[in-house]
Amino acid sequence: IFKKEQAMCLEKIQRANELMGFNDSSPGCPGMWDNITCWKPAHVGEMVLVSCPELFRIFNPDQVWETETIGESDFGDSNSLDLSDMGVVSRNCTEDGWSEPFPHYFDACGFDEYESET
């Protein structure tokens, strides 16, 4: 499942780079797959929000919040997400690259990076 998700993510990132005019020398943060979810490319100063991956509702069936579904846009309408929602993780794009996820996946979503690798 994760190999498939990763491949889909890399495709999305490539399309987003083309739409946004991003290349390897562009300032900002490249899109990435962090072994859990897909992060779109971002400009410095931008905060990107993602939902806890739908997949982990299988692992955590008690999780009851609504997760953002990917719509016509490859990355969904992340503007409709809010840090005041449960099950939302953010990263800031800084001059030094992506910040750590906040809250950490383990506390926002109930699972760890290591669970996604097995």
Epitope: N60, D62, Q63, V64, W65, L83, S84, D85, M86, V88, F102, P103, H104, D107, A108, G110, F111, D112, Y114, E115, E117, T118
Partner: antibody
Framework: QVQLQQSGPGLVKPSQTLSLTCAIS??????????WNWIRQSPSRGLEWLGR?????????HYAVSVKSRITINPDTSKSQFSLQLNSVTPEDTAVYYC?????????????WGQGTLVTVSS | DIQMTQSPSSLSASVGDRITITCRAS??????LNWYQQKPGKAPKLLIY???SLQSGIPSRFSGSGSGTDFTLTINSLQPEDFATYFC?????????FGPGTKVDIK
């Protein structure tokens, strides 16, 4: 029924190491759905979360910054228990220490607690 | 660290009263908030998780609400066994900080 039974000395001398153990029944320290936590309570600091250990393909620990340089939480899979070690204690570490299980249901919460151990740091 | 405050620090009430305890976080924590009850000499006991979900086995007279930074615990028709100290706790980001507590005693 999950039960947590604490053991360890109630008196520790300053500069020495505080060691407590929490024995788990009705669950396993290696559970891939729980976390195992230590919390303390004193009149001056109130309830203070100290740290946790958990197993998800590998063991992980998270510690409160206030004690990070002095604390170790270790699981013992052979006895299904976990321990707290707090080094270089001072009288400010005098408190009731609790172990507790963390459970996930939309968020992490502490649903089963040990009985508490009053630890006094004094010479 | 996320700071948690509670008000009032203590309150006196009678059996049958409806009481409300407030908890405030120093930053938004969504609904990552739990409530515990503690009686003297005992460990805390979970009452409410995720701001408003009642823990199994807890009477329905206990309820919680709130989101973001402001939360409330309400006890409808206070019973003799409810006289205790109540704590809120955030589990949004470690360290998982607790409020200082609200002591509910008999008027």
């Amino acid at each position: 029924q999950v039960q947590l039974q604490q053991s360890g000395p109630g008196l520790v001398k300053p500069s020495q190491t505080l060691s407590l153990t929490c024995a788990i029944s009705g669950d396993s320290v290696s559970s891939n759905s729980a976390t195992w936590n230590w919390i303390r309570q004193s009149p001056s600091r109130g309830l203070e979360w100290l740290g946790r250990t958990y197993y998800r393909s590998k063991w992980s620990n998270h510690y409160a910054v206030s004690v990070k340089s002095r604390i170790t939480i270790n699981p013992d899979t052979s006895k299904s228990q976990f321990s707290l070690q707090l080094n270089s204690v001072t009288p400010e570490d005098t408190a009731v220490y609790y172990c507790a299980r963390g459970t996930w249901k939309q968020l992490w919460f502490l649903d089963h607690w040990g009985q508490g151990t009053l630890v006094t740091v004094s010479s | 660290d996320i700071q948690m405050t509670q008000s009032p620090s203590s309150l006196s009430a009678s059996v049958g009263d409806r009481i409300t305890i407030t908890c405030r976080a120093s930053q938004s924590i969504s609904r990552y908030l739990n409530w515990y009850q503690q009686k003297p000499g005992k460990a805390p006991k979970l009452l409410i998780y995720a701001a408003s979900s009642l823990q199994s086995g807890i009477p329905s007279r206990f309820s919680g609400s709130g989101s973001g930074t402001d939360f409330t615990l309400t006890i409808n028709s206070l019973q003799p066994e409810d006289f205790a100290t109540y704590f809120c706790q955030q589990s949004y980001s470690p360290p998982f900080t607790f409020g200082p507590g609200t002591k509910v005693d008999i008027k």
